[in-house]
């Protein structure tokens, strides 16, 4: 049995994945729980097993199809339910009518690479992964650079207000190790949020030429 309040939050990656987290304040006995997705007009439904991520929250990924297939669109509404087994039957613990394109969180950008590096600047490119064709160019990015002696949280955010999959970092220190991350967000969707940060890309600026003033 369950007491207390629960929170059920899901995001669509814009292609073929809905990721959900269910949090439950009250005590939940050892039981099997799952998320069930039932689209309003599609000839499929999907479930995933909720697995614990902390003492009071569980997560799962609804895999709707091949990673780059467009399984849902702006016209869809998906009924999402948390179901937990109670004896021989399933009990509905949480339910929401989920509009995929109002609740977007894309996959983290991938394939980060240094295009060109100099003493004071570095040009970096990346790619977006599993992003819907519906966005066309309506995406924005945030980037951050980790400097020696600082934390990621201290790194200033650079905002790219358009679909630009590269950046030229300026005013870097010669012969210095840096790390770089980027994340992406569609402009569409009332509850849309930033993707996770990309894997960090490590790079080193070139040393200053000997005898040259830096």
């Amino acid at each position: 049995a369950v007491n207390g309040t629960s929170q059920f939050t899901c995001f669509y990656n814009s292609r073929a994945n809905i990721s959900c987290v269910w949090s439950q304040d009250g005590a939940l006995q050892d039981t099997s729980c799952q998320v069930h997705a039932w689209p309003d007009r599609r000839r499929w439904n999907q479930t995933c097993e909720l697995l614990p991520v902390s003492q009071a929250s569980w997560a799962c990924n609804l895999i709707l199809g091949a990673p780059d297939s467009q399984k849902l669109t702006t016209v869809d509404i998906v009924t999402l339910r948390v179901l937990c087994r109670e004896g021989v039957r399933w009990r509905v613990m949480a339910i929401q009518d989920f509009k995929p394109f109002e609740n977007l969180r894309l996959m983290a950008p991938i394939s980060l690479q240094v295009v060109h590096v100099e003493t004071h600047r570095c040009n970096i490119s990346w790619e977006i992964s599993q992003a819907s064709h519906y966005f066309e160019r309506h995406l924005e990015f945030e980037a951050r650079t980790l400097s020696p002696g600082h934390t990621w949280e201290e790194a200033p955010l650079l905002t790219l207000k358009q679909k630009q999959e590269w950046i030229c970092l300026e005013t870097l220190t010669p012969d210095t190790q840096y790390e770089f991350q980027v994340r992406v967000k569609p402009l569409q969707g009332e509850f849309t949020t930033w993707s996770p940060w990309s894997q960090p890309l490590a790079f080193r600026t070139k040393p200053a030429a000997l005898g040259k003033d830096t």
Partner: antibody, heavy 116, light 107 residues
């Protein structure tokens, strides 16, 4: 088995309104969108809009916005399409169809003739 | 609005022929395309959804393919009852739209 049965043919004068019914059976009525599609004589198919009976949610083709009204009566599993301010170019066969996968089951059609 | 352009607009063929009808969307619609068959004085009949999935009861000679903007309906071996008008349809975004139709006639 799934069936959509529509009301009979109508003859209307320009400026009048027409209300076409679509009675569903053989499935959970509240759960599936009902679409309305029309076909003028010798012409192709044109989507007018849709209603989800369980929630009353509605989406229109903007071309008909303000002239078309969709309603649903869950007690009788019937959907209604009312088109107002009729003109001669509204003469057409009007179909209801269920949306599951795409438009899978269709009503037999209702002929609406607008003539003075 | 997304335009669905079918070709050809009419086609003459014989029983046993293999026939292909194409449909081009003005924007990417993923695989949210359906195909319908309509005979004179009758309601459309659903054949294919999600570009390539046949509805129950639809003969296997009907097949659909494509994604993005280019789609095809193929009838592998025409039967006498297949002579009709065929429509493609996108339900990817509002307003839902149809192709102008392809009339398949007996040669």
């Amino acid at each position: 088995q799934v069936q959509l049965v529509q009301s009979g043919a109508e003859v209307k004068k320009p400026g009048a309104s027409v209300k076409v019914s679509c009675k569903a059976s053989g499935y959970t009525f509240s759960r599936y969108w009902i679409e309305w599609v029309r076909q003028a004589p010798g012409q192709g198919l044109e989507w007018m809009g849709e209603i989800l009976p369980g929630s009353g949610s509605i989406n229109h083709n903007e071309k008909f916005q303000g002239r078309v009204t969709f309603t649903a009566d869950t007690s009788t599993s019937t959907v209604y399409m009312e088109l107002s301010s009729l003109r001669s170019e509204d003469t057409a066969v009007y179909y209801c169809t269920r949306h599951y996968g795409s438009f899978d089951y269709w009503g037999q059609g209702t002929t609406v003739t607008v003539s003075s | 609005d997304i335009q669905m352009t079918q070709s050809p607009s009419s086609l003459s063929a014989s029983v046993g022929d293999r026939v292909t009808i194409t449909c081009k969307a003005s924007q990417n619609v993923g695989t949210d395309v359906a195909w319908f068959q309509q005979k004179p004085g009758k309601a459309p009949k659903s054949l294919i959804y999600s570009a390539s999935y046949r509805y129950n009861g639809v003969p296997s000679r009907f097949s659909g393919s494509g994604s993005g903007t280019d789609f095809t309906l193929t009838i592998s071996s025409l039967q006498p009852e297949d002579f009709a008008t065929y429509y493609c349809h996108q339900y990817s975004s509002y307003p839902f739209t149809f192709g102008q139709g392809t009339k398949l006639e007996i040669k």
